[in-house]
C-alpha cells in the first residue's frame, strides 16, 4: 500500500512538473499585419484563441518572454501567398524570409537564432502563388530573454492560424 502511495505521489509530482513546463504557441493576428517589403518585426500575435495557447511564458509587446531558464525547442512556420483577386505584385522577384531573434535585456544584445526562406519569382501570369517556411531548433534560454519574429514582405503573409505561427516549449532544465 505504501509503495502504491509513493508511486501515485511520484506520478502527481511528475504530472505537476509537466504541467509547469513552459510552452507557447502563438498565431498571427491578421487584423494587424504591417506593410512593407523590407524586414519588419511581427508584433501582433494571438496567445489565447483558436490553436494559440501559452503557459508559464509571457507574451508582451510582440515578444515571447522566457520566465524559466532551460533548454527550449523553438519553431516558426510562415506562409506567404498571393492571389490575383487582391491585385498585382509590384515586383515579381521576391525575397521571402523569416528571422527568429533572441533579445537579452540584462546584457542588451540581439541574435538571430534561426532564419529561413528563399528568393522567388512569382510570375504575373499565375493566378495564385504560395510558399511556406518552417524553422526549428534547440536553444538554451535564460529567464527574461525575449523571442521575436521578423519577416520580409509582410503584406504577403497568409493570415490563417494554421499557416503563420511560432512557439516554444521547454525540453529540460539547465544542469
Amino acid at each position: 500500500e505504501k509503495a502504491m502511495v509513493d508511486g501515485s505521489w511520484l506520478d502527481l509530482a511528475k504530472r505537476s512538473k509537466l504541467e509547469a513546463q513552459p510552452f507557447a504557441h502563438l498565431t498571427i493576428n491578421a487584423t494587424d499585419i504591417p506593410s512593407g517589403s523590407h524586414k519588419v518585426s511581427l508584433s501582433s500575435w494571438y496567445h489565447d484563441r483558436g490553436w494559440a495557447k501559452i503557459s508559464n511564458m509571457t507574451f508582451s509587446n510582440g515578444k515571447l518572454i522566457v520566465n524559466q531558464d532551460g533548454f527550449y525547442y523553438l519553431y516558426a512556420n510562415i506562409c506567404f501567398r498571393h492571389h490575383e483577386t487582391s491585385g498585382d505584385l509590384a515586383t515579381e522577384y521576391l525575397q521571402l524570409m523569416v528571422y527568429v531573434t533572441k533579445t537579452s535585456i540584462k546584457i542588451p544584445s540581439s541574435h538571430t537564432l534561426m532564419k529561413g526562406g528563399s528568393t522567388k519569382y512569382w510570375s504575373g501570369n499565375s493566378e495564385f502563388h504560395f510558399y511556406s517556411i518552417n524553422v526549428g531548433g534547440f536553444f538554451k534560454l535564460r529567464s527574461g530573454e525575449e523571442i521575436s519574429i521578423e519577416v520580409s514582405n509582410p503584406s504577403l503573409l497568409d493570415p490563417d492560424q494554421d499557416a503563420t505561427y511560432f512557439g516554444a516549449f521547454k525540453v529540460r532544465d539547465i544542469d
Epitope: 517589403s37 487582391s86 491585385g87 509590384a90 515586383t91 521576391l94 503584406s155
Partner: antibody, heavy 126, light 103 residues
C-alpha cells in the same frame, strides 16, 4: 495636394501613334503605380495597363498587348502612355490614375484608383 | 476573366430619395470591390474601396456593402450634385455603369 495633370487633346489618323503624358505632384512619385484607363463614347471604363513608377515594371491588358508602351520619367514625376496603330475605335478619353497602394511599402498594386487626371481626348479619324 | 455586371443601367429618383445600385461579379472576389463617380468633363472620383470603406472626403450619405460576388452602393439621401454615372470595379474589370438622374 495630390494632382495628376494630363496633356491636351489629340487628333490622329488611323495607323498613327499617340503619346499622352501625366504629370504627378503632391506625393512621392516613385512610391506608387500609375494606371491608364480609357472611356470610349457610350462605353464602360476600360483598364489598359499600369507602371510601377519606382522600378518601371509594367502590366498591360491583353487587348492592348503589342500596341501599348508605358514609360515614366522619375526626375520629371511624369508617366507616359503611347498607343500605336490607332483605329477609329480607339477614339476615347484617356485617363491616368494613381494606385492607392504604396507599392514600396505594400508590394501590391491594389487597383484602388484614388487620384485621377482630368482626361485626354484622343480622336482617331481619317 | 472576371466580368462585372451592374443594375440598373439607369435610374431616376427625387432629391432626398434612397438610391441603391447593385454590382455582381462573375465569381467570388472577396471584398475587392470599388465604386467610382463619373461626371461629364470631370475626373472620376473614388467613393468606396474594399466594398465598404469610405474614401476620405466623400460624403457619408454614400455607403457600400457586400462580399463574395454581390455588392451594393447606397446613396442614403440623393442630392442634386450626385447626378452622375456610377461604376463598380474589381482590379481590371469595370461594370457597365449606372446613370443616376433627378426626377
Amino acid at each position: 495636394q495630390v494632382q495628376l495633370v494630363q496633356s491636351g487633346a489629340e487628333v490622329r489618323k488611323p495607323g498613327a501613334s499617340v503619346k499622352v503624358s501625366c504629370k504627378a505632384s503632391g506625393y512621392d512619385f516613385s512610391n506608387y503605380a500609375i494606371h491608364w484607363v480609357r472611356q470610349a463614347p457610350g462605353q464602360r471604363l476600360e483598364w489598359m495597363g499600369w507602371i510601377n513608377a519606382g522600378n518601371g515594371n509594367t502590366k498591360f491588358s491583353q487587348k492592348f498587348q503589342g500596341r501599348i508602351t508605358v514609360t515614366r520619367d522619375t526626375a520629371a514625376s511624369t508617366a507616359y502612355m503611347e498607343l500605336r496603330s490607332l483605329r477609329s475605335e480607339d477614339t476615347a478619353v484617356y485617363y491616368c490614375a494613381r494606385d492607392s497602394s504604396n507599392a514600396v511599402r505594400g508590394i501590391i498594386i491594389a487597383y484602388y484608383f484614388d487620384y485621377w487626371g482630368q482626361g485626354t481626348l484622343v480622336t482617331v479619324s481619317s | 476573366e472576371i466580368v462585372m455586371t451592374q443594375s440598373p443601367s439607369s435610374l431616376s429618383a427625387s432629391v432626398g430619395d434612397r438610391v441603391t445600385i447593385t454590382c455582381r461579379a462573375s465569381q467570388s472576389i472577396s471584398r475587392y470591390l470599388n465604386w467610382y463617380q463619373l461626371k461629364p468633363g470631370k475626373a472620376p472620383r473614388l467613393l468606396i474601396y474594399g466594398a465598404s470603406s469610405l474614401q476620405s472626403g466623400v460624403p457619408s450619405r454614400f455607403s457600400g456593402s457586400g462580399s463574395g460576388a454581390e455588392f451594393t452602393l447606397t446613396i442614403s439621401s440623393l442630392q442634386p450634385e450626385d447626378i452622375a454615372t456610377y461604376y463598380c470595379q474589381h482590379t481590371r474589370a469595370f461594370g457597365q455603369g449606372t446613370k443616376v438622374e433627378i426626377k
